[in-house]
């Protein structure tokens, strides 16, 4: 399996946005890469977002995706927006080298994203 590295812990900012880098050790000269973010919570794994990109080009997520990202070489900079405290969990980066063959796939150990809902502002008189 291909090695995928990602940070162990990331704290979302006050606007509920968290960013982390997903880095993969490419065994070949991939031209097309698929990146998927999975969330693991309570032994349940769900897909958060996914994008296929051409090397050197921007990642294109679906219009309604909560993820955005950029790529540079074998690194993908992922940003997840709109997070709330209930979204705290382990976010796993899965990378697939789709083309040219051979196909390679690697899964990171996951990034624990902590989200703290901001305190509501007190009423000012």
């Amino acid at each position: 399996a291909m090695h995928v590295a990602q940070p162990a812990v990331v704290l979302a900012n006050s606007r509920g946005t968290a960013s982390f880098v997903c880095e993969y050790a490419s065994p070949g000269k991939a031209t097309e890469v698929r990146v998927t973010v999975l969330r693991q919570a309570d032994s349940q794994v769900t897909e958060v977002c996914a994008a296929t990109y051409m090397m050197g080009n921007e990642l294109t997520f679906l219009d309604d995706s909560i993820c955005t990202g950029t790529s540079s070489g074998n690194q993908v900079n992922l940003t997840i927006q709109g997070l709330r405290a209930m979204d705290t969990g382990l976010y796993i980066c899965k990378v697939e080298l789709m083309y040219p063959p051979p196909y390679y796939m690697g899964i990171g150990n996951g990034t624990q994203i902590y989200v703290i809902d901001p305190e509501p502002c007190p009423d000012s008189d």
């Epitope: 399996a1 291909m2 070949g28 000269k29 031209t31 097309e32 296929t52 051409m54 789709m98 083309y99 040219p100 063959p101 051979p102 196909y103 390679y104 796939m105 690697g106």
Partner: antibody, heavy 122, light 112 residues
Amino acid sequence: EVQLLESGGGLVQPGGSLRLSCAASGFTFKAYSMSWIRQAPGKGLEWVSGISNTGGSTDFADSVKGRFTISRDNSKNTLYLQMNSLRAEDTAMYYCARLGYSGYDDRGMDVWGQGTLVTVSS
Amino acid sequence: QSVLTQPPSASGTPGQRVTISCSGSSSNIGSNYVYWYQQLPGTAPKLLIYGNSNRPSGVPDRFSGSKSGTSASLAISGLRSEDEADYYCQSYDSSLSGPVVFGGGTKLTVLG
């Protein structure tokens, strides 16, 4: 049942054109890269062209570069090979094949069509 | 001229063990997986071995693959008449314009 079905072969004069089609069924076509492979009468297998699952990346053998183009329509589950400036040496059975994968594993060309015969002759 | 080199022919009698070799280089077999295909007369090729030594479901365990350095081999034990076919090795090559490379094929004849 996972299946690939080629069509579009036939007899064509040198310099002519043909478009081969490969209809896929029984699997999620848009998830797989695809290839065209040919086999001249009595000869071995020769890889011709490949295309990524999205259609964004393509490759060609030097022997067909500049004359053949590969494309796909994921909404129609169909792979194409447009062959222009055909030569006698392009005479062969043309197969489409799926580039398979499962889990962490590359599976090679795990599904093949039955082939379509292209004959280039005057 | 094929990138991977196979003997053009091989033969054996029913029940025998036959080995077919496939030789390449560091840019293909040396750094990539090897695959084997069986082509029965008048039919399309069929995947026999993937990832050097793995069999797809439905392929008998009489067929086995191995790889060492820049060479690979396909072994068929307990040879049967229905094994008479052409066998092709395939790998990927990082140094060529096209990623897929084949051997020239080996015609296996089952004698007797």
